[in-house]
């Protein structure tokens, strides 16, 4: 079934998303909103998908995203046994066969149809910034996060020496 925006919405059955023999350790369906409670929505326009950050009308249902969680070894793990090195990475898919991807050259976040295995640009390191806010760091470009810029998603460089709590890279996940 297609929603108002023209993006086929997930039903209860989560689609298969194993990659290169690695399965996600868990999956969840959630709507994504900004720190300021604007919704992240997805629309089909001219045969390509656009991502918007907008205030939702009361009667409009929030778009759901399938988050698939993967374990990964941290590249800077000091110990060879993996004790220090576990991170959680996620992929975000608002519709079957399409995933959010980082375009590091354009500093943009795009929705692309992908063949498996998924490219590294589709993986984001998960950060819990607070009790109910998360951030998504590019696997391919540490220190660069999905953020909000001019009512669109963009890639934003964060200086680790500063407080990482800047609101434009904070998102809320809700069922």
């Amino acid at each position: 079934a297609f929603g108002i925006s023209g993006v086929p919405k997930y039903t209860r059955a989560l689609h298969d998303s194993s990659i290169t023999g690695i399965s996600p350790i868990t999956e969840s369906l959630a709507s994504l909103s900004t720190y300021n409670d604007q919704s992240i929505t997805f629309a089909l326009e001219d045969e390509s998908y656009e991502i918007y950050v907008e205030d939702l009308k009361k009667d409009k249902k929030k778009d759901k995203v399938l988050l698939s969680y993967y374990e990964s070894q941290h590249p800077s793990s000091e110990s060879g046994d993996g004790v220090d090195g576990k991170m959680l990475m996620v992929t975000l898919s608002p519709t079957k066969d399409f995933w959010l991807q980082a375009n590091n050259k354009e500093h943009s976040v795009e929705l692309h149809k992908c063949e498996k295995p998924l490219p590294d640009q589709a993986f984001f390191v998960l950060h819990n910034r607070s009790f109910n806010c998360v951030s998504f760091e590019c696997k391919t470009d540490p220190g660069v996060f999905i953020g909000v810029k001019d009512n669109h998603l963009a890639l934003i460089k964060v200086d680790y020496s500063e407080n990482l709590g800047s609101e434009n890279i904070l998102f809320k996940l809700s069922e």
Epitope: T26, H74, K86, L88, N128, F131, L164, G165
Partner: antibody, heavy 121, light 106 residues
Framework: EVQLVESGGGLVQPGGSLRLSCAAS????????MYWVRQAPGKGLEWVAA????????YYPESVKGRFTISRDNAKNSLYLQMNSLRAEDTAVYYC??????????????WGQGTLVTVSS | DIQMTQSPSSLSASVGDRVTITCKAS??????LDWYQQKPGKAPKLLIY???NLQTGVPSRFSGSGSGTDFTLTISSLQPEDFATYYC????????FGGGTKVEIK
């Protein structure tokens, strides 16, 4: 090897204060959520405090809110729990615990051996 | 606050038995649930995370299942070293432990 060593427990009178410490080693302390969990004698586990990697946010259950304060010193790889206005029901073994993953608040992957706090007159 | 109700609070079993412990959340917690094992005088140890993922080094006789509000820990064939207390723990909204299940020798 991940190590968490608690200290600072002991006997304190009701209304008194105590500061617990947890010395961490064997991992990148500044990248992990950290927690305090307690266990009263013969009872179950109770989460009592949590703190984000950069110490920007801290969280408590209603049972200790306003009396306990969690803090951390990433330069010293140390976690603390300041306990004020202690009550008899705060008597417990207090465990320091580390998040399972870098950066996330999911799961308590490693635990210290605990330090006993006894509140009694 | 989310409440976690664990049952039974205690059970007696023999070596080789299949043991099942359940945990019920007061509201949907997705799969944000762990199981911990604690032996007398020792710190708890993470057994299973995100409902069904075995922590490194944990024997495959332990398994977890469930989603939403109902969760299960199963020990397929109880071994002498498995006599302990088991706790469920949710981290979907805040952090809450279940009351514990003591597995004793019959």
């Amino acid at each position: 090897e991940v190590q968490l060593v608690e200290s600072g427990g002991g006997l304190v009178q009701p209304g008194g204060s105590l500061r617990l410490s947890c010395a961490a080693s064997g991992f990148t302390f500044s990248s992990y959520w950290m927690y305090w969990v307690r266990q009263a004698p013969g009872k179950g586990l109770e989460w009592v405090a949590a703190i984000t990697p950069n110490a920007g946010e801290d969280y408590y259950p209603e049972s200790v809110k306003g009396r306990f304060t969690i803090s951390r010193d990433n330069a010293k790889n140390s976690l603390y729990l300041q306990m004020n206005s202690l009550r008899a029901e705060d008597t417990a073994v207090y465990y320091c615990a580390r998040g399972h993953y870098y950066y996330t608040s999911y799961s308590l992957g490693y635990w210290g051996q605990g330090t006993l706090v006894t509140v009694s007159s | 606050d989310i409440q976690m109700t664990q049952s039974p609070s205690s059970l007696s079993a023999s070596v080789g038995d299949r043991v099942t412990i359940t945990c019920k959340a007061s509201q949907n917690i997705n799969k944000h649930l762990d199981w911990y094992q604690q032996k007398p005088g020792k710190a708890p140890k993470l057994l299973i995370y995100f409902t069904n993922n075995l922590q490194t080094g944990v024997p495959s006789r332990f398994s977890g299942s469930g989603s939403g509000t109902d969760f299960t820990l199963t020990i397929s064939s109880l071994q002498p070293e498995d006599f302990a207390t088991y706790y469920c723990f949710q981290y979907n909204q805040g952090w809450t432990f279940g009351g514990g299940t003591k597995v004793e020798i019959k």
